[in-house]
């Protein structure tokens, strides 16, 4: 059962797993949710009736019955983890805590103009978990405007105290806002020889990498596969760190694999849930339950629905036994990983899928592409919106993409002659323009933010943001697309699609059904050759077939050039301009979104 509300002046008795410090009950609930075993918590707020050393304590708790006795206690706030809930969960915490000093290891001290600058510094520092900033009103002159970057073993403060004229907050890496480089490759036959901060058992290097990603101290990892010569180390996942944030050295070793935490990758690949099945593999751990199940898929469902289950092993039925049902062993451990992994016993193992909802909304799996054909199906491009103008009459004006729950990214040239945001309507979850009737719900536009260097599409900066009057509730038919990370500038995208309701040829009309076309990217050098009269800058990206035939056209403007990379869709381009439509040797020119990520973040995060 999902219980989201907090219980004031209430303490849960017993079931303690560990105590951490958090600046608020709300954040205590998030920490509990991400902890492998925590189901309930009790937070102690600051209060004259409480011992100050107990202020801000967050006691994480577990219970076999999923609940604990309640006791009245002033200043105690209790609640349940969101593990029991089906809604999207995020570790992202943008809150700034006034007059709180979050204690940790102060490893970097520098002057910053504002708390926001200090938070950005923390977000872009590989080791930083949280920060404390002394404001210009801070009593001690030499400490004013000092930004202290901090880290701890757990990622949460070791203590929190009241301190006037300081503010504290957390790194926004988990908000996918870091500009740190992101290394996604896994390096075979490689051991990174740096400090181990922890070790867990994992069935493969990908799971090891995902565990590293959401471990607060892990920056890179080494995994010993099941063929590793030393039996006691097989399936061992070593979580590592170093002062520089990168491995100081690497050792070549057969049957070992190494890689990096994806904490700075704007979560552009799912990092929490391990959805694969591991055949002929048994996961050992504390047994929660043994139930009969028809298949390993059914066993995984049972594990996902049992809130305390972390992983499982399914042993298929012996012929004609138990109505063809096998045994499903639901298991757990202190850290969420198997205590041992055995091979060759015939079991099929896997993990709970309840952690999948902890991934960034933009990484959520959407309907598979329909291969062939040009008409889209419902839910195929859930970030695509149709932007309508109501003046002089209502019509489709441009495409756009949902990039946040209040933000649409589109092209600046769409707003030529648009005097006011009041005449604009954004429709999401639309497949056919004919669905839009007088009573169809839409999002009003609060503000149009056009790049201040924009003059005309052909000279670049053809980018604009629409701030919506109300927030978008994410569903299967309307959800955001991931922005590319600045660390991904080197990615070569091979699966790119342009979508829109635009013309299918130069002299045509707006299409009723959302159209799609798979289009290859073209290098800027090649593109420049095709447009000798224009300057193709690095802030533009081109796509098209040399022979023409498929392209964006009038009415597609502002819509997405969506590219799939590592199973996740990225907004690589915004439809901008081109010579005619689908002409031979005239690729379409798109705004290169990765070059505007800073601008987008600056505008969307402005208070």
């Amino acid at each position: 059962e999902c219980v989201t509300q907090l219980l004031k002046d209430t303490c849960f008795e017993g079931g303690d797993i560990t105590t951490v410090f958090t600046p608020s009950a709300k954040y205590c609930q998030v920490v509990c949710t991400y902890h492998p075993r925590c189901l309930l918590f009790t937070f102690t707020a600051e209060s004259p009736s409480e011992d100050p050393t107990r202020w801000f304590t967050c006691v994480l708790k577990d219970s076999v019955t999923e609940t604990l006795p309640r006791v009245n206690r002033t200043a105690a706030i209790s609640g349940y983890s969101f593990k029991q809930c089906s809604h999207q969960i995020s570790a992202c915490n943008k809150d700034i805590y006034v007059d709180l000093d979050m204690k940790g290891i102060n490893y970097n001290s520098s002057v910053a103009k504002s708390a926001q600058e200090c938070q950005e510094r923390c977000t872009d520092d590989v080791h930083c978990h949280f920060f404390t900033y002394a404001t210009r009103q801070f009593p001690s002159l030499e400490h004013r405007n000092i930004c202290l970057l901090k880290h701890t073993q757990t990622g949460t403060p070791t203590r929190i105290t009241k301190l006037d004229k300081v503010v504290s907050g957390f790194s926004l890496k988990s908000c996918a806002l870091s500009n740190l480089a992101c290394i996604r490759d896994i390096f075979p036959n490689t051991v990174f020889a740096d400090s181990n901060i922890d070790s867990v058992m994992a069935p493969d290097a990908f799971v090891c990498g995902r565990i590293c990603t959401h471990h607060p101290g892990c920056l890179f990892f080494t995994f010993f596969s099941q063929e590793w010569p030393k039996e006691s180390q097989r399936n061992l996942c070593l979580l590592k760190t170093s002062e520089s944030g990168l491995p100081s050295t690497r050792i070549k070793k057969s049957k070992a694999l190494s890689g990096f935490s994806l904490q700075s990758c704007r979560h552009s690949i799912p990092v929490f849930c391990h959805s694969s099945f591991y055949h002929d593999t048994d996961f050992l751990g504390e047994e929660l339950d043994i139930v009969a199940a028809k298949s390993h898929e059914a066993c995984q469902k049972l594990c996902t629905n049992a809130v305390r289950c972390q992983f499982f092993t399914y042993t298929p039925a012996q012929a004609s036994c138990n109505e063809g049902k096998g045994k499903c062993y639901l298991k757990l451990s202190s850290n969420g990983s198997p205590t041992k992994i055995l091979h060759g016993r015939g079991g099929i193992s896997g993990y709970t899928l309840r952690l999948c909802k902890m991934d960034n909304e933009c990484t959520t799996k959407i309907k598979p592409r329909i291969v062939g054909g040009t008409a889209s199906v419902r839910g195929e491009w859930p970030w695509q919106v149709t932007l309508h103008t109501t003046s002089p009459t209502q019509r489709h004006l441009c495409g756009g993409s949902i990039i946040g729950n209040q933000w649409i990214l589109t092209a600046a040239h769409c707003f030529y002659g648009v005097e006011s945001p009041k005449i604009l309507r954004v429709y999401s979850g639309i497949l056919n323009q004919s669905e839009i009737k007088e009573d169809t719900s839409f999002f009003g536009v609060q503000e149009i933010i056009i790049h201040d260097q924009y003059k005309m599409a052909e000279s670049g900066y053809d980018i604009a943001l629409l701030k919506l009057e109300t927030t978008v509730n994410y569903t299967d038919s309307q959800r955001p697309i991931c922005l590319p990370s600045k660390g991904d500038r080197n990615v070569i995208y091979t699966d790119c699609w342009v979508t829109g309701w635009g013309y299918r040829k130069l002299r045509d009309k707006i299409q009723n059904t959302l159209q799609k076309a798979k289009i290859p990217l073209v290098t800027n050098e090649e593109c420049q050759k095709r447009y000798r009269g224009h300057k193709i800058t690095h802030k533009m990206i081109c796509a098209g077939y040399r022979e023409g035939g498929k392209d964006a056209c009038k009415g597609d403007s502002g819509g997405p050039l969506s590219c799939k990379h590592n199973e996740v869709w990225h907004l690589v381009g915004i439809t901008s301009w081109g010579e005619g439509c689908a002409q031979r040797e005239r690729p379409g020119v798109y705004t290169n979104v990765v070059e505007y990520v800073d601008w987008i973040l600056e505008k969307t995060q402005a208070v």
Epitope: I183, R184, D185, I186, T190
Partner: antibody, heavy 125, light 107 residues
Amino acid sequence: EVQLQESGPGLVKPSQTLSLTCTVSGGSIYSGAYYWSWIRQHPGKGLEWIGSIHYSGLTYYNPSLKSRVTISVDTSKNQFSLKLSSVTAADTAVYYCARDVDDSSGDEHYGMDVWGQGTTVTVSS
Amino acid sequence: DIQMTQSPSSVSASVGDRVTITCRASQGIDSWLAWYQQKPGKAPKLLIYAASSLQSGVPSRFSGSGSGTDFTLTISSLQPEDFATYYCQQYHIVPITFGGGTKVEIK
């Protein structure tokens, strides 16, 4: 067939920064299967590894040169570069770029299988 | 750093001779060793990788053996084009290091 070509000034003044670029043709630098390396050879002497870079930007340097070396990669130009600061006469050498195979298929095919022809750099005032 | 010691530093041999060059690592490197051939004014050329695997296009008269700390490059029947300097290289651990080289000269 992949080919590498070093380019950069042949003469550098002491205390200045030596800058060389290696252009990769006939194949993409964008591959997890390779590191891209710089090696030098002092006149009449053996080979000295300077450092390597992966397309992702992951670098390894020779500790004896680490404080002075920066290797970078530009996947859009299919190039990688070497910068060696505060040079002295002891940095006079033939500088080679090479492809270091680190095969992602894990079949243990390793070694520097493609080399540039080398460029002579003299440090002198 | 792992030191790679090659011996001999030079060897005089005739066409048709069998030539053996040894390379010793200051610590175990499993089989992470390569052999290169370098001719004057030219870049090195990869002959052997993983201690004993022949690089494609390299004549079969070249062979490598060894594991751990002791390695050998053998040219079974020396040809005129084989007169050059040979280097071993370990890539077990960064920094990558090369042996001092063995010059194979005409007798």
